[in-house]
Interface confidence: medium
């Protein structure tokens, strides 16, 4: 709406950088034949580039990352009773981010 | 997998709280009626409950919100030219979190 | 305060029966899956049995299997731990516990413990 | 049944450091958990998930495992330190304990 502006601040873009997001652990990254097992914990966070850049024809993308494995319980149903192991999940975090030119092919005349 | 233990770190729950998250501001926000024009900036941070709970039958939700109006410059392109006018979009910040139970519906028997 | 009150416990002659409780307070009791430990005098922990945070899975140690039944009420805040059939080799103090997720892990709070003794 | 063997005692010097082991098989497969226990009192949680430290558990105590053995590891031992220490693992549809290890510091 174009009313109550006095009370409004100005916004400010929100920059390209790291920011901590939620991830969500899917079971498929575990174990893709068998889904009789449940994964805790269900989410971690990791950090991802976000944010606007100046430009339109620039994007936020991470220029650096890092693998960082982490080990997550597998919570096996065998005969309605759990049986508990180890599992490695390999998150990626940007480490850091750039607005980066996103080249759109021009169609062919 | 559950190979290369040893140098995984135990994975940690991102628990239920307020996260930074970033927010794309949609030309329909400000105006419905017409597609002829910009906005800037095009994307700022919100406070957003984001992570996981300990149970499986609650979720993260946000449990005290509060609005927050913002002014951004709507960039309307007249005769080719821009014309630059304010506008306030209304955004909505997370203040605090609580998991929450989810009501499932039980089959009817 | 955070914390578990066992009582029921007793002396009992063998092959008689007994139900201990277990309150909980200062947190949310249905969001936690629950065990009874038990320790005979002088002996180390022995597991004794486990349920959800919602009474849908409960399990036992071979030694009890058959003769104790675990079970909770979440409206009351209350664990129960119904001992039936009670041999000499029962006599223990029972702890019970609290795991901090719904499926289990580690026991991060304790109650004091109620002695239990079958003799005749 | 699956069992954990830890050694009946250990004893070591003020401000030296003790090692305390749980051997079982495949054991670095599961999660280790170690409590305290002093006597006439209720046990307490001092590593859970082979590494983790309880919040109000001094730093001076950590923990390991891998292969078949867990390891709770006491640096610069205090004298209200004296207590059973029992390692615990969930395997097979069972909270398993091992027998406990008496750790003495010596006077």
């Known amino acids: 709406s174009l009313g109550s502006l006095a009370a409004a601040e100005p916004a400010v873009i929100a920059e390209c950088k790291t920011r901590t997001e939620v991830f969500q652990i899917s079971r498929n990254l575990i174990d893709r034949t068998n889904a009789n097992f449940l994964v805790w914990p269900p989410c971690v966070e990791v950090q991802r580039c976000s944010g606007c850049c100046n430009n339109r024809n620039v994007q936020c993308r991470a220029s650096q990352v890092q693998m960082r494995p982490v080990q997550v319980r597998k919570i096996e149903i065998v005969r309605k009773k759990p049986v508990f192991k180890k599992a490695t999940v390999t998150l990626e975090d940007h480490l850091a981010c750039k607005c980066e030119t996103v080249v759109t092919p021009r169609p062919v005349t | 997998s559950l190979g290369s233990l040893a140098a995984a770190e135990p994975a940690v729950i991102a628990e239920c709280k307020t996260r930074t998250e970033v927010f794309q501001i949609s030309r329909n926000l400000i105006d419905r009626t017409n597609a002829n024009f910009l906005v800037w900036p095009p994307c700022v941070e919100v406070q957003r409950c984001s992570g996981c709970c300990n149970n499986r039958n609650v979720q993260c939700r946000a449990s005290q919100v509060q609005m927050r109006p913002v002014q951004v410059r709507k960039i309307e392109i007249v005769r080719k030219k821009p014309v630059f006018k304010k506008a306030t979009v209304t955004l909505e910040d997370h203040l605090a979190c609580k998991c929450e139970t989810v009501v499932t519906p039980r089959p009817v028997t | 305060e955070v914390q578990l009150v066992e009582s029921g416990g007793g002396l009992v002659q063998p092959g008689g029966s007994l139900r201990l409780s277990c309150a909980a307070s200062?947190?949310?009791?249905?969001?936690?899956?629950m065990s009874w430990v038990r320790q005979a005098p002088g002996k180390g922990l022995e597991w004794v049995s486990y349920?959800?945070?919602?009474?849908?899975?409960?399990y036992y140690a071979d030694s009890v299997k058959g003769r104790f039944t675990i079970s909770r009420d979440n409206s009351k805040n209350t664990l129960y731990l119904q001992m039936n059939s009670l041999r000499a080799e029962d006599t223990a103090v029972y702890y019970c516990a609290r795991h901090p997720y719904w499926y289990g892990g580690q026991l991060d709070l304790w109650g004091q413990g109620t002695l239990v003794t079958v003799s005749s | 049944s699956y069992e954990l063997t830890q050694p009946p005692s250990v004893s070591v010097a003020p401000g030296q450091t003790a090692r305390i082991s749980c051997s079982g098989d495949s054991l670095g497969s599961y999660f280790v958990h170690w409590y305290q226990q002093k006597p006439g009192q209720a046990p307490v949680l001092v590593i859970y998930d082979d590494s983790n430290r309880p919040s109000g558990i001094p730093e001076r105590f950590s923990g390991s495992n891998s292969g078949n053995t867990a390891t709770l590891t006491i640096s610069g031992t205090q004298a209200e330190d004296e207590a059973d220490y029992y390692c615990s693992a969930f395997t097979h549809n069972s909270d398993v304990f091992g027998g406990g290890t008496k750790l003495t510091i010596k006077r």
């Open positions: 349920i959800s945070d919602d009474g849908s899975l409960k």
């Open positions: 200062g947190f949310t009791f249905s969001s936690y899956a």
